[in-house]
């Protein structure tokens, strides 16, 4: 009779581990920026510090009647979901509440900023163990709120935010759109996106993953032993904050990048029905439902990667899109995708000391996305080798010429606007292992990395018949680092990685034009990290 | 989100109102004004003035004070509600929107954002 949400996110092997030490206090501290809370509730009593922080706007309406239990409702429920004795995710975690939302659940960007600054000051005055900040709120896109989250994240604080309940692109809201926060969408007991009246969970590239957020049983501020069910992306974010608290409790030195990568890697994949999301958002939205990951001791030195999509470039002729990895991550490959297929490719360049993934729109194109593959590669030394476009009819070869460097990704960028005169570039895995090969008018970029025990190989899969997409997956134990589409149809939409699957997309009209001998090939670069081994290229 | 999404950014390079302050007249506004794309969520009259990242503590206070002084010269009373030191350099101010052009021309100002609502989710 365990509540469905806890069953979903905490695998069976963790349940017993938790039952053995229900009150095992950890040094992790969760800061909740929300409404006031009822600290005397039995779920959270003794675990919650209600700070004196209060920065809220006046309630609307002259006839508004402040009722304590209603004022405390949202925050109390979330505090219970994070650290409640009986229905909480991280039962032993201490929580600090800051009031930034009024009795109607409204706050301001400025009040939230002052709250975040309060946490930073507390951190400076009295440094403690790991800090998790839960932001179960959303407003319109705010550059300063996102910047404040970035600054706080760079001090080692882990921020978890609600994606928003507007059935809209999460990138249009803050703090959901801040790359440095872990942004959480909401799913129900059937692992489907949560509908809330006419609206529902937000979606899109700014969402990192989903978590239970429908009919969640938690502390009710109505009475000290009351429970109620609430729904929303706040509840989903609270689950992830609880998971993060538990991860940090076990391993306090985990960084934001490691936490995010592990949350993504160990989440439940492909259970969400993507048809609920708008068609143009389906490819950008992660099909991931959070679960509590095992500790790093149990899983060894796995190579962890995630896919980061850029914002849409827009349709102008020279429009570019840029995708960035987090500071700790290595950009192992860069690809591009355009719904019209009119794109001039992708490349990696250094901006302000950081490698970024860029994609360029083509004349008549509706715009492109840059797709970065961002990985955690301990002690990595990565570099980009590029060769300008060759003369007509010649191939361009780029390989990793430094000793012990392996190819982790290829990018291709065409100088010519006319898509009909060029052939797609290729990866050659047989005759020339570990090379990126470009054709007519293509500049070729090879991403080369050296790291202890890093080994990589190319895996290809081609389809000759009509097909909208071609996929190739890396086998168990290997991680997808690069994904490209190889010659076939004259027009491909591009390629991108979905978890460990490389997806090459083909234009509908191209399928009709194509002769059966002209296969479209998805080419994946699969790598693994074996700390005891030398870096190598696997034939 | 690298690009500013559904977001209003206005360049307010308003003509300088001469008030005998040479440095003000000389300083052309390169800072931008931003506000929430959803009109109902805006809080006009309250603004977050964000200064360049390297701005020192004393300069933050000086910039806020300078804005108050110049506003007063024009017959406006402004209220500095909060000064941000620890996460980013800046200050929160309650003032008339008439003063935005003036504020954008202050030294060290990177951008000004109109305050807006956030909501429990």
């Amino acid at each position: 009779s365990i509540p469905w949400n806890l069953e979903r996110i905490i695998p069976a092997w963790h349940q017993t581990e938790e039952d053995r030490s229900p009150d095992g206090s950890s040094q992790v501290e969760v800061y909740l920026l929300d409404t006031s809370i009822q600290g005397a509730h039995r779920e959270i009593e003794g675990r919650v510090t209600i700070t004196d922080f209060n920065s809220v706007p006046e309630e609307d309406g002259t006839r508004f009647h402040r009722q304590a239990s209603k004022c405390d409702s949202h925050g109390t429920h979330l505090a219970g979901v994070v650290s409640g004795r009986d229905a909480g995710v991280a039962k032993g975690t201490s929580l600090h509440s800051l009031r930034v939302l009024n009795c109607q659940g409204k706050g301001t960007v400025s009040g939230t900023l002052i709250g975040l600054e309060f946490i930073r000051k507390s951190q400076l005055i009295q440094p403690s163990g790991p800090l998790v900040v839960l932001l179960p709120l959303a407003g319109g896109y705010s550059r300063i709120l996102n910047a404040a989250c970035r600054h706080l994240a760079r001090t080692g604080v882990v921020l978890v935010a609600a994606a928003g309940n507007f059935r809209d692109d999460a990138c249009l809201y803050s703090p959901a759109s801040a790359p440095e926060v872990i942004t959480v969408g909401a799913t129900n007991a059937q692992d489907q996106p949560v509908t809330l009246g006419t609206l529902g969970t937000n979606f899109g590239r700014c969402v990192d993953l989903f978590a239970p957020g429908k009919d969640i049983i938690g502390a009710s501020s109505d009475c000290s032993t009351c429970f109620m069910s609430q729904s929303g992306t706040s509840q989903a974010a609270a689950h992830v904050a609880g998971i993060v608290a538990r991860m940090l409790s076990r391993e306090p030195t985990l960084t934001l990048a490691e936490l995010r990568q592990r949350l993504i890697h160990f989440s439940t994949k492909d259970v969400i029905n993507m048809a609920w999301f708008p068609e143009d958002q389906q490819v950008l939205t992660p099909n991931l439902v959070a679960t509590l990951p095992p500790s790093t001791h149990e899983t060894g030195g796995q190579l962890l990667c995630r896919t980061v999509w850029s914002a849409h470039s827009g349709p102008t002729r020279t429009a570019t899109a840029t995708a960035r990895c987090a500071p700790e991550e290595e950009l192992l490959s860069c690809s591009s995708f355009s719904r019209s297929g009119r794109r001039r490719g992708d490349w990696i360049e250094a901006i302000g000391g950081q490698q970024v993934c860029k994609a360029l729109n083509a004349f008549g194109g509706e715009g492109v996305y840059a797709v970065a593959r961002c990985c955690l590669v301990p002690r990595a030394n990565c570099s980009i080798h590029n060769t300008p476009a060759a003369r007509a009819g010649l191939e361009t070869h780029v390989h990793c010429h430094q000793k012990d460097h392996v190819l982790t990704g290829c990018s291709f960028h065409w100088e010519v606007e006319d898509l009909s005169v060029r052939r797609q570039p290729a990866l050659r895995s047989r005759r020339q292992p570990g090379q990126c090969v470009g054709h007519q008018a293509a500049s070729v970029y090879a991403s080369c990395c050296h790291a202890p025990g890093l080994e990589c190989k190319i895996k290809e899969h081609g389809i000759s018949g009509p097909s909208e997409q071609v996929t190739v997956a890396c086998e168990a134990g290997w991680t997808l680092t690069g994904c490209n589409v190889l010659p076939g149809a004259s027009l491909t939409l591009g390629a991108y990685s979905v978890d460990n699957l490389c997806v090459a997309r083909v234009h509908d009209t191209a399928r009709a034009d194509r002769t059966s001998g002209e296969a479209t090939v998805a080419a994946a670069i699969c790598c693994r990290s074996r700390p005891s081994a030398k870096a190598s290229w696997v034939q | 989100q690298d690009e500013d999404g559904d977001y209003e950014e206005l360049m307010l390079a308003l003509p300088s109102q001469e008030d005998g302050l040479a440095d003000e007249a000389a300083h052309v506004a390169t800072a931008t004004f931003r506000r929430c794309s959803k009109e109902a969520w805006r809080l006009p009259g309250t603004y977050i003035v964000v200064l360049m990242e390297e701005t020192q503590r004393l300069q933050i206070e000086q910039t806020a004070h300078r804005l108050q002084t110049r506003a007063a010269r024009r017959g406006y009373v402004i209220k500095v509600l909060h000064i941000f030191y620890d996460l980013f350099p800046g200050f929160l101010v309650k003032m008339s929107s008439d003063l935005l052009g003036l504020a954008l021309k202050l030294p060290h100002v990177e951008y000004i954002e109109e305050d807006s609502f956030v909501f429990a989710q």
């Epitope: 009779s1 365990i2 509540p3 039952d19 229900p22 009150d23 005397a40 039995r42 239990s69 004795r85 009986d86 229905a87 039962k91 049983i217 109505d222 009475c223 000290s224 032993t225 009351c226 429970f227 069910s229 | -």
Partner: antibody, heavy 126, light 106 residues
Framework: QLQLQESGPGLVKPSETLSLTCTVS??????????WGWIRQPPGKGLEWIGS???????YYNPSLKSRVTISVDTSKNQFSLKLSSVTAADTAVYYC??????????????????WGQGTLVTVSS | EIVLTQSPATLSLSPGERATLSCRAS??????LAWYQQKPGQAPRLLIY???NRATGIPARFSGSGSGTDFTLTISSLEPEDFAVYYC????????FGGGTKVEIK
């Protein structure tokens, strides 16, 4: 049908620790649907809640008694226990154990004390 | 803590009569109030929960009403087995009990 039975010494000396056990039969103490509580009633007086425990071991106590109370659970024996330290004559009472719906599983029934054990009188005297 | 005051302390009535017992809270307990019946030498028994809901097996002659700070337990027609002590209890803020009302035979 669920039954609760209190057991323990009927006489405790002042300043010592009072120890009682409640044995649950006809149902499992390891249900996430219930808390298990202790309530006392001094002779001729009203009822006072002492504290409650969940199967996982999480507890919550009456603030006025918190410093002296420890409640523990033994799921293997289907029992939960009360320890009250530094007792005085004012702790003389009939001690009851009772089940309380946790609220975590709303369908489990009303969030009140029901059923109760028949109670055991503990006298504090030298 | 929330203090519950019961009145009257003693109610002397005859079988068949209507009994009205009052419980007043020092602050609002919403509808988080229950009534228990205790007979000599027995444990209390839950009669009414959440102010007005009858517990399983409780006869229809018992009813509860009220919310906020003022609550009433009504026994429409007293039966011989109803003569006992009645306690109210709140769970708005932890658990506290009233001092009890004794319903005795007149």
């Amino acid at each position: 049908q669920l039954q609760l039975q209190e057991s323990g010494p009927g006489l405790v000396k002042p300043s010592e620790t009072l120890s009682l056990t409640c044995t649950v039969s006809g149902g499992s103490i390891s249900s996430s649907s219930y808390y298990w509580g202790w309530i006392r009633q001094p002779p001729g007086k009203g009822l006072e809640w002492i504290g409650s425990i969940y199967y996982s071991g999480s507890t919550y106590y009456n603030p006025s008694l918190k410093s002296r109370v420890t409640i523990s659970v033994d799921t293997s024996k289907n029992q939960f226990s009360l320890k009250l330290s530094s007792v005085t004559a004012a702790d003389t009472a009939v001690y009851y154990c009772a089940r309380e719906n946790s609220g975590v599983v709303p369908a489990a029934g009303p969030n009140w004390f029901d059923p109760w054990g028949q109670g055991t009188l503990v006298t504090v005297s030298s | 803590e929330i203090v519950l005051t019961q009145s009257p302390a003693t109610l002397s009535l005859s079988p068949g009569e209507r009994a009205t017992l009052s419980c007043r809270a020092s602050q609002s307990v919403s509808s988080y109030l229950a009534w228990y019946q205790q007979k000599p030498g027995q444990a209390p028994r839950l009669l009414i929960y959440d102010a007005s809901n009858r517990a399983t097996g409780i006869p229809a002659r018992f009813s509860g009403s009220g919310s906020g700070t003022d609550f009433t337990l009504t026994i429409s027609s007293l039966e011989p087995e109803d003569f006992a002590v009645y306690y109210c209890q709140q769970r708005r803020n932890w658990f506290t009990f009233g001092g009890g009302t004794k319903v005795e035979i007149k």
